[in-house]
């Protein structure tokens, strides 16, 4: 019996508008009906929660209204989008998947996606 595996891309480049999207996919060892997906940022040895959402299998993923994340789910695959990123937010973003219900609970974490964010150059003043 293999442990739950979570896959995510190694590298993603954020758009010029500070938006980064990636897929988090997991191989489930059980028939979960309730799944929690958390995005965590690891900088040095510090790990901080970026956003989290719980969803019922077959239903949509809903983050809190003030979250910087949005996402959609399809089976064992979650499409995650993080918005409002700036150059200082460049770092390793880890996808954590928890099978919450029914018991038993299972935990899986991906190896992390290195998100690179480049602040756009300010537009030069136009002389007319």
């Amino acid at each position: 019996c293999k442990a739950m595996h979570v896959a995510q891309p190694a590298v993603v480049l954020a758009s010029s508008r500070g938006i980064a999207s990636f897929v988090c996919e997991y191989a489930s060892p059980g028939k979960a009906t309730e799944v929690r997906v958390t995005v965590l940022r690891q900088a040095d040895s510090q790990v901080t929660e970026v956003c989290a959402a719980t969803y019922m299998m077959g239903n949509e993923l809903t983050f809190l209204d003030d979250s910087i994340c949005t996402g959609t789910s399809s089976g064992n695959q979650v499409n995650l989008t993080i918005q409002g990123l700036r150059a200082m937010d460049t770092g390793l973003y880890i996808c954590k998947v928890e099978l919450m219900y029914p018991p038993p609970y299972y935990l899986g974490i991906g190896n992390g996606t290195q998100i690179y964010v480049i602040d756009p150059e300010p537009c030069p003043d136009s002389d007319f």
Partner: antibody
Framework: QVQLVESGGGVVQPGRSLRLSCAAS????????MHWVRQAPGKGLEWVAV????????HYADSVKGRFTISRDNSKNTLYLQMNSLRAEDTAVYYC????????????WGQGTLVTVSS | DIQMTQSPSSLSASVGDRVTITCRAS??????LNWYQQKPGKAPKLLIY???SLQSGVPSRFSGSGSGTDFTLTISSLQPEDFAAYYC?????????FGPGTKVDIK
């Protein structure tokens, strides 16, 4: 800094009830799974129960299922363990523990509170 | 449920000895394996998490290895303060079982 302080232990007769509390501080309480772990005198560590995040999901060891109830009040940063139908074999030091946000390890433990079930 | 076994259950060693404790899970737990040290009358203390990561403030003579079902805790040169009980624990799936413990005492 992270602090976990248990209270509510004591001596109780078999079949009676007791409620343990754990006051947490120094971290965002609702972002963490919170656990109870116990240790009978001279014995090893035994995981008792966990409650996740918003309190909707709870899991128990078979030895306490149906008798113990774990709960949390995120507005008060407090974890509880309601223990009913207590037995002599529930005699132990009960520890409140915070699971790590990433891999679930127990990096922070309370000082423990002793529960003695005896007639 | 995942069962955790530990060996040996106790061992006698001398200061300076290299000590190895093994832990086995009844099924794969990936790297969700943690090691704790406990001294009499005290709460357990985390030594190693995620199979091989050293907890901040823990001396580098402690190390962990393994993945899947087989794990090892090694103390490279036993110090007087290391005489204690050691427990492994899995944080992969409920119930989050501990191993039965290994007591390390003075030879």
């Amino acid at each position: 800094q992270v602090q976990l302080v248990e209270s509510g232990g004591g001596v109780v007769q078999p079949g009676r009830s007791l409620r343990l509390s754990c006051a947490a501080s120094g971290f965002t309480f609702n972002s963490y799974g919170m656990h109870w772990v116990r240790q009978a005198p001279g014995k090893g560590l035994e995981w008792v129960a966990v409650i996740w995040y918003d309190g909707n999901n709870k899991h128990y060891a078979d030895s306490v299922k149906g008798r113990f109830t774990i709960s949390r009040d995120n507005s008060k940063n407090t974890l509880y363990l309601q223990m009913n139908s207590l037995r002599a074999e529930d005699t132990a030091v009960y520890y409140c523990v915070r699971g790590d946000i990433l891999t679930g390890y127990y990096g922070y433990w309370g000082q423990g509170t002793l529960v003695t079930v005896s007639s | 449920d995942i069962q955790m076994t530990q060996s040996p259950s106790s061992l006698s060693a001398s200061v300076g000895d290299r000590v190895t404790i093994t832990c086995r899970a009844s099924q794969s737990i990936s790297s969700f394996l943690n090691w704790y040290q406990q001294k009499p009358g005290k709460a357990p203390k985390l030594l190693i998490y995620a199979a091989s990561s050293l907890q901040s403030g823990v001396p580098s003579r402690f190390s962990g290895s393994g993945s899947g079902t087989d794990f090892t805790l090694t103390i490279s040169s036993l110090q007087p303060e290391d005489f204690a009980a050691y427990y492994c624990q899995q944080s992969y799936s409920t119930p989050f079982a501990f191993g039965p413990g290994t007591k390390v005492d003075i030879k």
